[in-house]
């Protein structure tokens, strides 16, 4: 779609003359009819195949053509065509006396022609004029013409329809040969694309508007290129998303068990030494003269019963003192006047005499100690269970009650997580320390492999009339590209194109 | 147990300000994005904004952006909201919760009232 | 924005019946959906997350199904405490959006 535009400058016919020699009376009135019309080597008589145009009468005899509009016609005239420039024409300008105001053929004598010129050539599309002149015996015509395309209309032929846009469809302006010049921060083929933020993720992120960087379910920061952990993890880190790597001092799937209830809580008071025994568990070892299960109880310095083998204690202001009772002696009554022969040995000990019997030594049966075996034995206080277990006394015997994740004897034996296959569409599963991993195969995600991905929604074929589908990858939909003359969403209209011509 | 406690709601004419606080506990803070979730009286839950752990990373839904900011200290394992040019359509029970924009959230703080009239 | 549609509104049931909500996307998200139960003047809580995923400490009879644009949400055998409203939420495309919410009121 063009405009052939055509600029009268000058007419000069002095002597006011038709074309037959006849004079005008009382000058001629000139007015102009234009014919343009495809190419031909003479040019003929017959229909103006690209378009007609007549003025309104411009002038008597001769005068020079204003450039803009002059009684109602347009200098330049406009030949509109809709069609794509051949680059080759014919031109026919005839001048015509006006006897009264009706200018149509039919209403004018058939010698009120005053000249008649006719050519024919190439012309390119441009916004140059071409400049023209041309004399009979009697008149002179001066002019310039040229092609140019319409608004929206590109290249060498008038053919490329362009028309910027900046929206959904496309963001763009047109460059002179009708091509799309993206504006800053789209691309693609329609400019439809975003650029999104330098250096945001290719994989983990995405943009719906230039410059941005949005993350993928997972993941987060301005380049998406960290992860977030699992929604249940308490005191943990991850590598990839969902994961729960605990921080130190914590354990368990989601790591929400204290492994180091001494640090996190410091519970021991009065300068008493904390040791962590398991999850949420600790043992204070407490200063002299406290007491109490986070050593918070100040004592005197008999509470703490110094006085061994059954020797009674006495607070004194310097400390206290011990009184012994028959057969011992010594700061804290421990040492025996008795021998083996006054059987001073409890719950079935041996008794061993030494140093020539002055004094002796019991021997005790499993599950009691002490200097007469008097004590039974707390098989817990070693600590004997691994892994954050809890040790139970069970009569002459102990047990571990182990943390989920761990079993044997100790808690020694860590449980495979992957032995209930827990990894969906073959998944490789993948113990670790806080719990299990699975690899998916191509086509699955999800933490469990549950999620079908990548669906090529192109193989159905779904476009129309030779259109390239592309896939969209964020959403599994296509896309189709349609070639020049088909729209839709699957390019199944067809454009109204506008008829041929013959020539 | 993990707690996420707001303060800082209340009555303010529409133009005006408030700074919205939430205090966590339970869980390591500096590790997990956070969010703000808004309900306006006898309505629905709504997205307001979120920020990542590390590189305090924000986002913001359209009607408040320019205009309220997200932000946290990892050290006091606190988050805020700082909400100027109220209107009187950010009237709304406020709530902090552990999430971002692209995870569910996972917990939710018991939230605060911001009440915007003149 | 991805538009989040409930059905139904409110719904009202007894004790012990089976129960469930639907949530349709406007567009394909996946499974990155969660469910939240609210009872009146408390905050939600986290009941179902990745689409069937149920969260820590939520009992079983709650099941959530669906995948791309239709979820559901499935009460087994309705207890007294499960009378609240429940909101289903994207998370797969930016910003999240949430239903409109369902009622489930005790008949």
């Known amino acids: 779609s063009g405009v052939f535009q055509l600029q009268l400058q000058e007419f000069i016919n002095e002597r006011g003359v038709l074309a037959s020699g006849r004079p005008c009376e009382p000058g001629c009135r000139t007015f102009f009819r234009v014919c343009l019309k495809h190419f031909q080597a003479v040019v003929s008589p017959g229909p103006c195949t690209f378009g007609t145009v007549s003025t309104p009468v411009l002038g008597t005899n001769s005068f020079a053509v204003r450039d803009d509009s002059s009684g109602g016609g347009r200098n330049p005239l406009q030949l509109p065509f809709n069609f794509t420039w051949p680059g080759t024409f014919s031109l026919i300008i005839e001048a015509w006396h006006a006897p009264g105001d009706d200018l149509r053929p039919e209403a004018l004598p058939p010698d009120a022609l005053i000249s008649k010129i006719a050519i024919q050539g190439s012309l390119a599309v441009g916004q140059n004029w071409l400049l023209d002149e041309q004399t009979s015996t009697l008149t002179r015509l001066r002019y310039s013409y040229r092609v140019i395309c319409s608004d929206n209309y590109y290249g060498d032929n008038c053919s490329r329809l362009c028309k910027k846009r900046n929206d959904h469809f496309g963001h763009y302006v047109c460059q002179p040969d009708g091509n799309l010049s993206c504006l800053p921060g789209w691309t693609g083929e329609y400019c439809q694309q975003p650029i999104c933020l330098s250096g945001c993720h290719e994989q983990n992120g995405y943009c719906s508007k230039p410059a941005e960087c949005l993350c993928r379910p997972g993941w987060q920061g301005r380049l998406c290129n960290e992860c977030i952990p699992h929604n249940g993890c308490r005191h943990g880190t991850c590598s990839t998303p969902w994961q729960c790597t605990c921080d130190e001092g914590w354990g368990g799937l989601f790591c929400d068990q204290d492994l180091n209830y001494c640090t996190h809580h410091s519970p021991c008071k009065n300068g008493a030494t904390c040791s962590n025994s398991g999850q949420r568990s600790y043992t204070c070892t407490c200063r002299p003269g406290y007491t109490g299960v986070d050593c918070e109880l100040e004592l005197s310095e008999c509470d703490s019963n110094p006085c061994r083998n059954g020797g009674s204690c006495k607070d004194q202001e310097d400390g206290y003192h011990c009184l012994c009772p028959p057969g011992y002696y010594g700061l804290h009554c421990e040492h025996s006047t008795l021998s083996c022969a006054d059987s001073p040995c409890f719950n079935g000990g041996s008794c061993r005499e030494r140093n020539q019997g002055a004094n002796y030594a019991c021997e005790c049966p499993p599950n009691f100690t002490g200097s007469n075996c008097e004590k039974k034995v707390d098989r817990c206080t070693s600590n004997p269970c691994a892994n954050g277990g809890q040790c139970l006394n069970r009569g002459p015997s102990r047990m571990c009650r182990c943390r989920p994740g761990f079993t044997g004897t100790y808690c020694e034996l860590h449980v495979s997580d992957c032995a209930r296959n827990p990894c969906a569409h073959g998944g490789t599963c993948h113990d670790l320390e806080n719990g299990l991993m699975c690899t998916c195969p191509a086509g699955f995600s999800g933490r469990r492999c549950e999620v079908r991905t990548s669906i090529d929604a192109c193989a159905s074929s779904p476009c129309f009339n030779r259109a390239t589908c592309y896939t969209d990858l964020s959403t599994d939909t296509f896309v189709c590209n349609c070639p020049y003359g088909f729209v839709g969403s699957r390019c199944e209209f067809p454009v109204g194109l506008p008829p041929s011509f013959p020539w | 147990e993990v707690q996420l406690v707001e303060s800082g709601g209340g009555l303010v004419q529409p133009g005006g300000s408030l700074r919205l606080s939430c205090a966590a506990s339970?869980?390591?803070?500096?590790?997990?994005?956070m969010a703000w979730v808004r309900q306006a009286p006898g309505k629905g839950l709504e997205w307001v904004a979120t920020?990542?752990?590390?590189?305090?990373?924000?986002y913001y839904r359209d009607s408040v952006k320019g205009r309220f900011t997200i932000s946290r200290d990892n050290a006091k394992n606190s988050l805020y909201l700082q909400m100027n040019s109220l209107r009187a359509e950010d009237t709304a029970v406020y709530y902090c919760?552990?999430?971002?924009?692209?995870?569910?959230?996972?917990?939710w703080g018991q939230g605060t009232l911001v009440t915007v009239s003149s | 924005d991805i538009q989040m549609t409930q059905s139904p509104s409110s719904l009202s049931a007894s004790v012990g019946d089976r129960v469930t909500i639907t949530c349709r996307a406007s567009e394909d998200i996946y499974s990155n959906l969660a469910w939240y139960q609210q009872k009146p003047g408390k905050a939600p809580k986290l009941l179902i997350f990745?689409?069937?995923n149920l969260a820590d400490g939520v009992p079983s009879r709650f099941s959530g199904s669906g995948s791309g644009t239709d979820f559901t949400l499935t009460i087994s055998s309705l207890q007294p405490e499960d009378f609240a409203t429940y909101y289903c939420?994207?998370?797969?495309?930016?910003?999240?959006?949430f239903g409109q919410g369902t009622k489930l009121e005790i008949k």
């Open positions: 990745d689409t069937n």
């Open positions: 920020i990542s752990s590390s590189d305090g990373t924000t």
């Open positions: 339970g869980f390591t803070f500096s590790n997990f994005p």
């Open positions: 939420q994207q998370y797969n495309n930016y910003p999240p959006t």
């Open positions: 919760s552990r999430g971002y924009y692209n995870s569910p959230f996972a917990y």
